[in-house]
Interface confidence: low
């Protein structure tokens, strides 16, 4: 054999006896007829030698160490070569060692080409015998980062201040490349960062530096996990010890991109997070240890990446192919921020593209699935536009405002289904007719159904909210002057059972000038509470609203206002209310900005209540609440 090392290559080759064996016959390195058991070859040297036995691999090992000095000159970054080539070396178990020294401020990154690395613990060996031992440096102290085999998930290891990489190859292994490259990075401000990449299901067992010995005092080590979004990662601690801390607390921190509560801090004894979708980082932070009795901090943990269970294996078909101008969004429902870890909750299109929000549009059939531990964390919001562009074609046309059954069958709660109803300006108006009469939600008589309809103007410049209405009241229909949005909002999961109660028909009708007209047909059994639109913010300036209140022949209606004065102060114009008997056309007019509101009044026949606003001064808005109660006419009202 001949080994020649180029001058200034900073390579040293050492051939020495390996682990003692029970082989009877010894073996020697023979140089110029001298028999020796160790041979050191330095840069610039050329040595010819032989072995005294047929199978030197049973006796000797070879170490090839290259020192790379990044302190005094430029660092040779890039793919690391096996030098000398393995074909020029004797067939011994060989260990290539690269010792890189760098400034504290320089980050060094080892990049492993496929196959990536798999960390092994004490007493474990690699199936193919190829091992990678990696260590770092803190000042003069060597820190063992770990020992790794092939066929794992570790793709990059970042360190600073220097790195020692040892690649052990069995004598029979044909490998002739190092399988890694070195790159420079900015300071990582910690002991090391290990990147672990999962391309599919699998698991990785990882350990703190120096494991099973103690993690260096007050150090920080980070693992970065790259996980496809459609898979879930769970962390479990297989073995850990805590040291005796004098200052600070030993902990692990999770950083999950997109999380609003980063970093998530856990004690080592806590149950670690599971069901994380996508990438995440885990950091181990040591503490200042008690000098007298330091103890040791060590951690061995497993990351398991797998396909999620149960709901996620179901595919839901959302058929919007027959819909027009509709979009369905599945998104996280807002939650109070907490420092507690919350696993990812994703919705996937075609089981592949997973994200926390998903919007489906009309015209297609969509297949979706969920990656979520708790589907109550998600809700659905749907928007549909029904517009009329040609008033001649639309007039008297009706549309049913119903939530499609495909949507109701999804395992996610429907939050809002909004219909945007658009009409040609000054040409047509709209009428909403519910399948079941509606009740207006008021503080005095709140809705207690699982859903309500929120009716508001859909004209951008107009801030007009007609109110919230639920089934089981006395409002027979609502007429509105122009564009509105009707939102079916659910308040309880029981909406699924009550879905049959929903049903609203919208028709395009001839244009009228009032902002809204409510047709009310009270029942004898209950008191009907009605309030002006934009409650709490006040009826918009110069807006007029009417209530058409039906009184059956054998009943008397009692109209009651709930305050003495309207409270409105007009800047310009007048605010007034007209109460008009429909049969006789007799009317009473009240100046709302001056008069006291009428005392309870009795109406034997159907009547109108019309309220028209002025331009009020800010803070002095027009808000009125009134009730209508029916009593039989036979009662002596005197």
């Amino acid at each position: 054999f001949e080994i020649a090392l180029p001058r200034e290559s900073n390579i040293t080759v050492l051939i020495k006896l390996g682990t003692p064996t029970l082989l009877a016959k010894p073996c020697y390195i023979v140089i110029s007829k001298r028999h020796i058991t160790m041979l050191s070859i330095k840069s610039g040297e050329r040595i010819v030698f032989t072995f005294s036995c047929q199978s030197p691999e049973n006796h000797f090992v070879i170490e090839i160490q290259k020192n790379i000095d990044c302190m005094s000159g430029p660092c040779p970054f890039g793919e690391v070569q096996l030098q000398p080539s393995t074909s020029l070396l004797p067939t011994l178990n060989r260990t290539f060692i690269w010792d890189v020294k760098a400034h504290k401020s320089i980050g060094l990154e080892l990049q492993f080409s496929i196959p990536r690395l798999r960390q092994i613990g004490p007493g474990e060996s690699c199936p193919d015998g190829v091992t990678h031992s990696i260590s770092g440096r803190i000042d003069a102290t060597v820190v063992r980062i770990g020992t790794f085999c092939s066929n794992g998930t570790v793709s990059r290891i970042k360190m600073q201040e220097g790195v020692k990489m040892a690649l052990h190859l069995p004598w029979f292994h044909p490998r002739n490349v190092s399988g890694f490259s070195i790159a420079n990075r900015s300071s990582i401000k910690r002991l090391c960062i290990i990147e672990s990449v999962f391309e599919g299901e699998g698991s990785a067992t990882l350990m703190s530096a120096n494991y099973p010995e103690g993690f260096p005092e007050d150090e920080l080590m980070t693992w970065q996990f790259v996980v496809p979004a459609h898979l879930r990662a769970s962390v479990s601690f297989l073995n850990f010890n805590l040291s005796n801390c004098e200052r600070k607390e030993e902990r692990v921190e999770y950083y999950i991109p997109g999380s609003t509560t980063n970093p998530e801090v856990f004690k080592l004894e806590d149950k670690q997070p599971g069901n994380m979708a996508g990438n995440f980082n885990l950091s181990l932070q040591g503490c200042d240890q008690d000098a007298q009795s330091p103890g040791i901090l060590r951690l061995q943990f497993q990351v398991l990446v797998q396909h999620p269970q149960n709901e996620s294996n179901k595919i839901y078909v959302v058929d919007l192919s027959n819909e027009r101008a509709m979009s369905l969004t599945i998104e996280p429902r807002p939650v109070k921020q907490s420092r507690k870890f919350v696993p990812g909750c994703f919705v996937c299109l075609e089981s592949r593209t997973c994200s926390s929000n998903l919007t489906l549009t009309s015209g297609s059939k969509h297949k979706i699935s969920f990656l979520c531990d708790d589907l109550t964390r998600l809700w659905m919001n749907v928007e549909k536009t029904i517009s009329c562009t040609d008033h001649r074609y639309c007039q008297r046309k009706s549309y049913s405002l119903q939530v499609p059954s495909d949507i109701l069958h999804l395992p996610v709660e429907l939050h809002d289904f909004s219909w945007k109803l658009l009409v040609p300006k000054d040409r047509l108006s709209l009428v909403l007719v519910p399948a079941q009469k509606l009740q207006q939600h008021t503080h005095e008589k709140p809705c207690n159904t699982s859903f309500s309809y929120l009716v508001a103007s859909a004209i951008p410049s107009q801030d007009l909210y007609f109110g919230s209405f639920c089934p089981g009241g006395s409002i027979k229909q609502i007429q509105v002057k122009q564009n509105i949005s009707v939102t079916l909002r659910t308040f309880a999961p029981s909406f699924q059972q009550e879905a049959s109660r929903q049903g609203l028909t919208v028709s395009f009708i001839p244009y009228f000038k009032e902002e809204g007209v409510f047709t009310v047909t009270p029942d004898t059994k209950s008191k009907v509470y009605l309030r002006t639109p934009n409650w709490d913010r006040g009826l918009p300036s110069l807006t007029s609203v009417s209530w058409n209140i039906s009184v059956p022949r054998d009943q008397v209606a009692c109209l009651t206002f709930f305050k003495e004065r309207s409270g409105v102060v007009c800047q310009t114009g007048r605010a007034f209310m007209i109460i008009q008997e429909q049969r006789t056309r007799a009317e009473e007019i009240f100046s709302l900005d001056e008069d006291v509101l009428p005392k309870p009044s009795f109406h034997h026949h159907s009547f109108w209540v019309n309220i028209s606003n002025c331009s009020p001064t800010s803070g002095k808005q027009l808000d009125l609440l009134f009730s209508v109660t029916l009593t039989p006419r036979t009662v002596d009202l005197t």
Epitope: I114, R118, P127, N151, G152, E199, G200, E201, G202, S203, Q306, H307, E350, R352
Partner: antibody, heavy 116, light 108 residues
Framework: EVQLVESGGGLVQPGGSLRLSCAAS????????MHWVRQAPGKGLEWVAS????????SYADSVKGRFTISADTSKNTAYLQMNSLRAEDTAVYYC?????????WGQGTLVTVSS | DIQMTQSPSSLSASVGDRVTITCRAS??????VAWYQQKPGKAPKLLIY???SLYSGVPSRFSGSRSGTDFTLTISSLQPEDFATYYC??????????FGQGTKVEIK
């Protein structure tokens, strides 16, 4: 509906070459690993090669390393197996399979006969 | 490579019988084991993945279990259409995948 259709099999002399194709429909191969598995007449299943089109990572059984090359054209949604230096022991039905829940979808197979 | 030792190589059973096929991995493969059914002239079909998860569309009479490196496929009540060859396969750490030798389930 997910479907895998293999083609390109046939009779070839020892030392010859063949290129098998696996046309996928109903899913995008970019998101899955694609595998070739073979079955010699009257024998069991033998995994041959795999590719993850999204990473370009390929892997081979020792028995075919250096002779077979797996590739994928994501624009055609097709995986390929280029087989060179064919031997009699390569005679088998070659199946293309999708890797997701293990090998969850398989093609109907294409027969490769290596004989002089 | 990881070896998968499957037993028995063949078995005879009657309709309604409970059938058990086992596979032993030469080293730890976690739960990365799948079971396939193959009928003559047809491609294999996935039955079980992740050692015990039933693949969609597969009848519930098929089940899988794991005990360390031993894996079992059970058919609780054999049906006429279940007569076929069954293969186990490990896919731990992805490559190389290895299959068991197969178990032929024949009519008694």
């Amino acid at each position: 509906e997910v479907q895998l259709v293999e083609s390109g099999g046939g009779l070839v002399q020892p030392g010859g070459s063949l290129r098998l194709s696996c046309a996928a429909s109903g899913f995008n191969i970019s998101y899955y690993s694609m595998h070739w598995v073979r079955q010699a007449p009257g024998k069991g299943l033998e995994w041959v090669a795999s590719i993850s089109p999204y990473s370009g990572y390929t892997s081979y059984a020792d028995s075919v390393k250096g002779r077979f090359t797996i590739s994928a054209d994501t624009s055609k949604n097709t995986a390929y197996l280029q087989m060179n230096s064919l031997r009699a022991e390569d005679t088998a039905v070659y199946y293309c399979a999708r890797g997701y829940y293990a090998l969850d979808y398989w093609g109907q197979g294409t027969l490769v006969t290596v004989s002089s | 490579d990881i070896q998968m030792t499957q037993s028995p190589s063949s078995l005879s059973a009657s309709v309604g019988d409970r059938v058990t096929i086992t596979c032993r991995a030469s080293q730890s493969v976690s739960s990365a084991v799948a079971w396939y059914q193959q009928k003559p002239g047809k491609a294999p079909k996935l039955l079980i993945y992740s050692a015990s998860s039933l693949y969609s569309g597969v009848p519930s009479r098929f089940s899988g279990s794991r005990s360390g490196t031993d894996f079992t496929l059970t058919i609780s009540s054999l049906q006429p259409e279940d007569f076929a060859t069954y293969y186990c396969q490990q896919y731990y750490y992805f490559y190389p995948f290895t299959f068991g030798q197969g178990t032929k389930v024949e009519i008694k």
